[in-house]
């Protein structure tokens, strides 16, 4: 038997893949345990192993089937359950009825590259991954700047407040590195929250032009 | 649906081993638990090993445990059974099978199945 507290929270992607991770504060060391899906209105059932991402937390991917088919929708509604393993038995951990498109974290932005640089500015695009077309255009972007000599925690947060999938860069000094991340959140869902930041994008700013500031 | 080929099966000696392999396509693999039946002229189908979708946790038939091992590389769509120590009464057609629910997995009708591999052992 387990105590402590237990804290199981999942995130959908929009598409075809359930993140969930799972907390137990009595940690269970060498127990097999999995999480399932059971969705209210499809008839398919998918379970994936918890695997250990800290002394006390759990995680897996539900793969719901190939990276862009939209396998849930708005109206979708999916029992998980953490089961583990007692000898021959199998127990439930934990539940929630899942509302995956309340519960929304999408991929991590892809494909960033810098269209346009000059000595004080940068004109950079990207892409998303595996967003349903449900959202339309109702998606929110955040972006960050990495300036030398500060962390990405010091770098202030540029909020693009509708789906724009570039964005210019201002006021940055010459000949000097940066790197470049966003993120994305759809504006639907309660419990939504942002994707993971992009890979970073390094690039450098144009040197300025002798006895000339461009 | 995944569909699945399996190979690696033949006429051996008892004591002897095999490996036979499974070869996923058609979907993502990783979603599915797989599995390995074997079926012996006259009798049911028979649930001999599993191994869940990361590969970390493994289930055994009583009769084949501590003889055989099953494994999978997600990076070749493929699942494992190494057979050693065989005897006489490993004899048997053996079959690949998937399925997204882990639970369900010893459920014959649940499953996606191979066409099978023959495997006889000689006495």
């Known amino acids: 038997a387990v105590n402590g507290t237990s804290q199981f929270t999942c995130f959908y992607n929009s598409r075809a893949n359930i993140s969930c991770v799972w907390s137990q504060d009595g940690a269970l060391q060498d127990t097999s345990c999995q999480v399932h899906a059971w969705p209210d209105r499809r008839r398919w059932n998918q379970t994936c192993e918890l695997l250990p991402v800290s002394q006390a937390s759990w995680a897996c991917n539900l793969i719901l089937g190939a990276p862009d088919s939209q396998k849930l929708t708005t109206v979708d509604i999916v029992t998980l359950r953490v089961l583990c393993r007692e000898g021959v038995r199998w127990r439930v951990m934990a539940i929630q009825d899942f509302k995956p498109f309340e519960n929304l974290r999408l991929m991590a932005p892809i494909s960033l590259q810098v269209v346009h640089v000059e000595t004080h500015r940068c004109n950079i695009s990207w892409e998303i991954s595996q967003a349903s077309h449900y959202f339309e255009r109702h998606l929110e972007f955040e972006a960050r700047t990495l300036s030398p000599g500060h962390t990405w925690e010091e770098a202030p947060l540029l909020t693009l407040k509708q789906k724009q999938e570039w964005i210019c860069l201002e006021t940055l000094t010459p000949d000097t590195q940066y790197e470049f991340q966003v993120r994305v959140k759809p504006l639907q869902g309660e419990f939504t929250t942002w994707s993971p930041w992009s890979q970073p994008l390094a690039f450098r700013t144009k040197p300025a032009a002798l006895g000339k500031d461009t | 649906e995944v569909q699945l080929v399996e190979s690696g099966g033949g006429l051996v000696q008892a004591g002897g081993s095999l490996r036979l392999s499974c070869a996923a396509s058609g979907d993502v693999f990783v979603r599915y638990t797989m599995a390995w039946f074997r079926q012996a002229p006259g009798k049911e189908r028979e649930f001999v090993a599993s191994?869940?979708?990361?590969?970390?946790?493994?289930d055994y038939g009583d009769s084949v445990k501590g003889r055989f091992t099953v494994s999978r590389d997600n990076a070749k769509n493929t699942v494992y059974l190494q057979m050693n120590n065989l005897k006489p009464e490993d004899t048997a057609v053996y079959y690949c099978?998937?399925?997204?629910?882990?639970?369900?997995?010893?459920?014959?009708?649940?499953?996606?199945w191979g066409q099978g591999t023959q495997v006889t052992v000689s006495s």
């Open positions: 099978a998937a399925n997204t629910d882990y639970f369900q997995i010893r459920s014959l009708d649940a499953n996606t």
């Open positions: 191994v869940t979708d990361s590969g970390r946790t493994t």
